[in-house]
């Protein structure tokens, strides 16, 4: 069962698996949630002990029964991991802790104007896990305004001390705020030299990459495939680092694959969730249970529902045996990965899907698109919403995109003349406008947040957020789209689609069925040539065919320009403006969402 509350002055007795230092009980709970085995924890605050070395300790615990005896202890705070919960889990911690110094290896010292600048520096430094910033009031003159970047083997502090006039906090890489490059390529027949910080068993290079991504010290990896000549090293995933942050040497090695951690783009790619099945493969580990079930999917479901299960192997039933039920072996290990991987055994193996909720919902695979045709099918664009106004009569006003369970991203120009959010209705999971009747459920708008630099669509900043009155429950037909990652600045998107119920030609009417059009992106230089009377800024992005014919039009405004990259859809643009519709050499101009990621996160996470 999911228990989110914290228990003050309570200590959970026994079950210790590890002790780390965290600045708060809340952060201890997050660390516990991300630890492969932790189900419960006890945090010791500064008042709980006479001994300052015991302050801020976070004891991670496990229990076969998922519970431990409770003992009264002043200053202790205990709680449960969020593994048992169905809600989204994030490692993002934006909190700044005053008068605390988180200890680690201090590897960089520089002057910064503010704690925020120091945190940004940490976020944009490949090695940095957390930082301490000495304020202007710090007693030592030479240390005032000093920003210390720190790292540790575990990513958590080696100790936390009280220290007046300093502030401390964590890197925001896990909040998708890093400007570091995001290298998604996996290099075949390549091994990286450099030091190994850890090694685990993985069934393929993509699982290896995911493990590297959420390992605090891993910057890149080398994976030895099943065909690797040295049997003892097959399926071995080597987690690596270097001082420069890049591999020093690339060695040509047949049957090895190498790549990089996706820590700077982890919000827009699944890094915890290993959803594939591995046929003719056995995962070895500590056995938790053996259950007779029908099929490997049922086995995975069983593993996902068993909170301590990390991975499984399903042994299919022998013909006509046991009503077609095979044996489902639920397993776990100290690090969440199999201790050994055996091939050619006839088993089907995989991982729990419990960790999928640690990834952004937007990374979930959606139904394959129907290629060709202009009308969409249900569930094809599950982030697309239709925004209606009820004044003077109800009608479709603009498109928009779900980016969070209470947030719609749209265009600022949609709200010209809109005096109050009360007249707005957001319909989600809609394919045909004709579905919208008087009794159709909708989401009310609590707040309209328009970018404060917005004046008119053509001059940019054409972006707005709608905060919904209630939260959206995600389903196959209504789920969020990923924001582009700041680390993806150099990605060239080749699979982009514009969607909406807008006009199909300049003088037309709102369409009943959601329309879609595949449109190529156009460089800003090229776009500027087509719009000599306007300034096409880097905060805009253009798309369209030279010959015209396909474009967004009136009524599509605020809707998404969605681009698929590495199997994940990203909200690259917001339909903003253009000269006419689908005119020759007049591309559509969209708000470049990448340039507003900070603004979006600032407003939605305030």
């Amino acid at each position: 069962e999911c228990v989110t509350r914290l228990f003050k002055d309570i200590h959970f007795e026994g079950g210790d698996i590890a002790t780390v230092f965290t600045p708060s009980a809340k952060h201890c709970q997050v660390v516990c949630t991300h630890h492969p085995r932790c189900l419960l924890f006890t945090f010791t605050g500064e008042s709980a002990s006479e001994d300052p070395t015991q302050w801020f300790t976070c004891v991670l615990k496990d229990s076969v029964t998922e519970t431990l005896p409770r003992v009264n202890r002043t200053g202790a705070i205990s709680g449960y991991s969020f593994k048992q919960c169905s809600h989204q889990i994030s490692a993002c911690n934006k909190d700044i802790y005053v008068d605390l110094n988180m200890k680690g290896i201090n590897y960089n010292s520089s002057l910064a104007e503010s704690a925020q600048e120091c945190q940004e520096r940490c976020t944009d430094d490949v090695h940095c896990h957390f930082f301490t910033y000495a304020t202007r009031q710090f007693p030592s003159l030479e240390h005032r305004n000093i920003c210390l970047l720190k790292h540790t083997q575990t990513g958590t502090p080696t100790g936390i001390m009280k220290l007046d006039k300093v502030v401390t906090g964590f890197s925001l890489k896990s909040c998708a705020l890093s400007n570091l490059a995001c290298i998604r390529d996996v290099f075949p027949n390549t091994a990286f030299a450099d030091s190994n910080i850890d090694s685990v068993m993985a069934p393929d290079a993509f699982v290896c990459r995911r493990i590297c991504t959420h390992h605090p010290g891993c910057l890149f990896f080398t994976f030895f495939s099943q065909e690797w000549p040295k049997e003892s090293q097959r399926n071995l995933c080597l987690l690596k680092t270097s001082e420069s942050g890049l591999p020093s040497t690339r060695i040509k090695k047949s049957k090895a694959l190498s790549g990089f951690s996706l820590q700077s783009c982890r919000h827009s790619i699944p890094v915890f969730c290993h959803s594939s099945f591995y046929h003719d493969t056995d995962f070895l580990g500590e056995e938790l249970d053996i259950v007779a079930v029908k099929g490997h999917e049922a086995c995975q479901k069983l593993c996902t529902n068993a909170v301590r299960c990390q991975f499984f192997t399903y042994a299919p039933a022998q013909a006509s045996c046991n009503e077609g039920k095979g044996k489902c072996y639920l397993k776990l290990s100290s690090n969440g990965s199999p201790t050994k991987i055996l091939r050619g055994t006839g088993g089907i193996s995989g991982y729990t899907l419990r960790l999928c909720k640690m990834d952004n919902e937007c990374t979930t695979k959606i139904k394959p698109r129907i290629v060709g045709g202009t009308a969409s099918v249900r569930g094809e664009w599950p982030w697309q919403v239709t925004l209606h106004t009820t004044s003077p009569t109800q009608r479709h006003l603009c498109g928009g995109s779900i980016i969070g369970n209470q947030w719609i991203l749209t265009a600022a120009h949609c709200f010209y003349g809109v005096e109050s959010p009360k007249i707005l209705r957001v319909y989600i999971g809609i394919l045909n406008q004709s579905e919208i009747k008087e009794d159709t459920s909708f989401f009310g708008v609590q707040e309209i947040i328009i970018h404060d630099q917005y004046k008119m669509a053509e001059s940019g900043y054409d972006i707005a957020l709608l905060k919904l009155e209630t939260t959206v429950n995600y389903t196959d037909s209504q789920r969020p789209i990923c924001l582009p990652s700041k680390g993806d600045r150099n990605v060239i998107y080749t699979d982009c689609w514009v969607t909406g119920w807008g006009y199909r030609k300049l003088r037309d009417k709102i369409q009943n069925t959601l329309q879609k059009a595949k449109i190529p992106l156009v460089t800003n230089d090229e776009c500027q040539k087509r719009y000599r009377g306007h300034k096409i800024t880097h905060k805009m992005i253009c798309a369209g065919y030279r010959e015209g014919g396909k474009d967004a039009c009136k009524g599509d405004s605020g809707g998404p320009l969605s681009c698929k990259h590495n199997e994940v859809w990203h909200l690259v643009g917001i339909t903003s403006w253009g000269e006419g519709c689908a005119q020759r050499e007049r591309p559509g101009v969209y708000t470049n969402v990448l340039e507003y990621v900070d603004w979006i996160l600032e407003k939605t996470q305030a």
């Epitope: 110094n101 030592s140 003159l141 030479e142 000093i146």
Partner: antibody, heavy 124, light 107 residues
């Protein structure tokens, strides 16, 4: 052994410039700040400025602003102090001195290691 | 800038006796004060930092006290090698400033 070794004595004409070097050894050069202090004959100590060898940031005493430049070369663990538009009152012994350890936060410190000093004589 | 004033300018003391040197700041420097010893023809040597903490290798006969604007360096029993000039220095604000020095000479 931690030490700071400075360049040799200099004799300069008024209006000229002088560049004094200070080579550090026995510790991590970029982890400590470096100060420059001078002492005119028979006078007390006068602080001139500071450099952070890691990023190269500097802070100078108002009196020397516009005339002094402090630089560093991390490859040779050397800091330099250049004083331009020399006048006779710049005749002094110039010292480099190691300041705070910048990779740890602590409240109090002093200049714990000093160079042997470089005598600069300004005379026409 | 913060002006540091040392007194007396010269202190005549016999070996084995106690010497007390004063340093006054024109405004509070908290405990951000260091003391240095300088012998003729040599570079200064750090004795005390943080107003009262002895630097590495400094004998226990040297002690520092005070905070805010009034500071004292005490040499409990003067040895022959202690006859030198002593400077105080504030580390509380830019520019760093030194006192004019106190010369401790043999009586």
């Amino acid at each position: 052994e931690v030490q700071l070794v400075q360049s040799g004595a200099e004799v300069k004409k008024p209006g000229a410039s002088v560049k004094v070097s200070c080579k550090a050894s026995g510790y991590t050069f970029t982890s400590y700040s470096m100060h420059w202090v001078r002492q005119a004959p028979g006078q007390g100590l006068e602080w001139m400025g500071i450099i952070n060898p890691s990023g190269g940031s500097t802070s100078y005493a108002q009196k020397f602003q516009g005339r002094v430049t402090m630089t560093r070369d991390t490859s040779t663990s050397t800091v330099y102090m250049e004083l331009s538009s020399l006048r006779s009152e710049d005749t002094a012994v110039y010292y480099c001195a190691r300041g705070a350890y910048l990779l740890e936060l602590y409240y109090y410190y002093g200049m714990d290691v000093w160079g042997q000093g470089t005598t600069v004589t300004v005379s026409s | 800038e913060i002006v540091m004033t040392q007194s007396p300018a010269t202190l005549s003391v016999s070996p084995g006796e106690r010497a007390t040197l004063s340093c006054r700041a024109s405004q509070s420097v908290s405990s951000n004060l260091a003391w240095y010893q300088q012998k003729p023809g040599q570079a200064p040597r750090l004795l005390i930092y943080g107003a009262s903490t002895r630097a590495t290798g400094i004998p226990a006969r040297f002690s520092g006290s005070g905070s805010g604007t009034e500071f004292t360096l005490t040499i409990s029993s003067l040895q022959s090698e202690d006859f030198a000039v002593y400077y105080c220095q504030q580390f509380n604000d830019w520019p760093l400033t030194f006192g004019g020095g106190t010369k401790v000479e043999i009586k």
